[in-house]
């Protein structure tokens, strides 16, 4: 079943190299156990770039090596990725999942284009 | 389509049980969603009464918790709203429909049903 | 209980015009709000889901807004198949009706 989801068009990366935007999921219910994966689309290819599977109410938990963190609200998913550089500019796609109790919805965003700007290099001082 | 059809008696006398069945077609009870009775009473005011998941679980109003069952019959896919010592209070047309997950939208009602209580 | 207050309880309006019902929570419910036509003789028809969220088959002319505690329900370029009670529902925690709201069309 497909589900509305909705996410901003544009965001910037600060200087650190870290973006946030939020991702909302409109269901008709109150699912209990959701899946939130973000895909990076550049070129016509499409790569996962994290996901994290979480109980209603609890803390999104990706890998311990993950770039992305993320905090949920009722519907609205808080997510951050870090570790970002220039050649990282692309469109960063959410998708969510509502895995129980079925059945199952599934919705994919139209993306994000996250701008990423690498700093000037700090000139030497004497 | 997803169809459903309450059935039951029209008048119950105080004190006694009441007891509906929803039918449904169209969907298996048994494969997802949350199916529920809601009631309207003759003012117009819409309340609901609880529901029976797809795995048979409950969830009741705290209001009527220790009045009401819900229970399901999944061979003919029908399940059943029994309300126990009812009073002229219980008159109104009962609803069943269905939402999904804990709480949510109902998106598939019956017509409904009228019911009386009244010696 | 999450108490939903919808309001007005009825209203007249005319063809081609527009409406607007609003729907107060006594608490946040997270934009899970839902609302409902309702006519006689039948079942309540689902016509908005998620605040904003059109059920498949509902006309544009139907419109949901809000958050927090603080919810909308608009109709505009009324049509005479819109006479009916119209309802809220809140489910961000049980489910919850509000009191509803009688259109007739002057």
């Known amino acids: 079943k497909a589900m509305h989801v909705a996410q901003p068009a544009v965001v910037l990366a600060n200087s650190r190299g870290t973006a946030s935007f939020v991702c909302e999921y409109a269901s008709p219910g109150k699912a209990t156990e959701v899946r939130v994966t973000v895909l990076r689309q550049a070129d016509s290819q499409v790569t996962e770039v994290c996901a994290a599977t979480y109980m209603m109410g609890n803390e999104l938990t990706f890998l311990d090596d993950s770039i992305c963190t993320g905090t949920s609200s009722g519907n609205q998913v808080n997510l951050t990725i870090q570790g970002l550089r220039a050649m990282d500019t692309g469109l960063y796609i959410c998708k969510v999942e509502l895995m129980y109790p079925p059945p199952y919805y599934m919705g994919i965003g139209n993306g994000t284009q996250i701008y990423v700007i690498d700093p000037e290099p700090c000139p030497d001082s004497d | 389509d997803v169809q459903l059809q309450e059935s039951g008696p029209g008048l119950v006398t105080p004190s006694q049980s009441l007891s509906l069945t929803c039918s449904v077609t169209g969907y298996s009870i048994t494969s997802g969603y949350s199916w529920n009775w809601i009631r309207q009473f003759p003012g117009n005011k819409l309340e609901w009464m609880g529901y029976i998941r797809f795995d048979g679980n409950n969830n009741y109003n705290p209001f009527l918790k220790n009045r009401i069952s819900i229970t399901r019959d999944t061979s003919e896919n029908q399940f059943f709203l029994k309300l126990n010592s009812v009073t002229t209070e219980d008159t109104a047309t009962y609803y069943c429909?269905?939402?999904?997950?804990?709480?949510?939208?109902?998106?598939?009602w019956g017509q409904g049903t009228s019911v009386t209580v009244s010696s | 209980d999450i108490v939903l207050t919808q309001s007005p309880s009825s209203l007249s309006a005319s063809l081609g015009g527009k409406v607007t019902i609003t729907c107060k929570t006594s608490?946040?419910?997270?934009?899970?709000m839902a609302w409902y036509q309702h006519k006689p003789g039948k079942g309540p028809r689902l016509l908005i889901y998620y605040t904003s969220i059109l059920q498949p088959g509902i006309p544009s002319r139907f419109s949901g807004s809000g958050s927090g505690t603080d919810y909308s329900f608009s109709i505009n370029n009324l049509e005479p198949e819109d006479i009916a009670t119209y309802y809220c529902?809140?489910?961000?925690?049980?489910?919850?009706f509000g009191g509803g709201t009688m259109l007739e069309i002057k």
């Open positions: 608490q946040d419910i997270n934009k899970y």
């Open positions: 529902q809140q489910y961000d925690n049980l489910n919850t």
């Open positions: 429909a269905r939402n999904y997950g804990t709480w949510g939208a109902m998106d598939f």
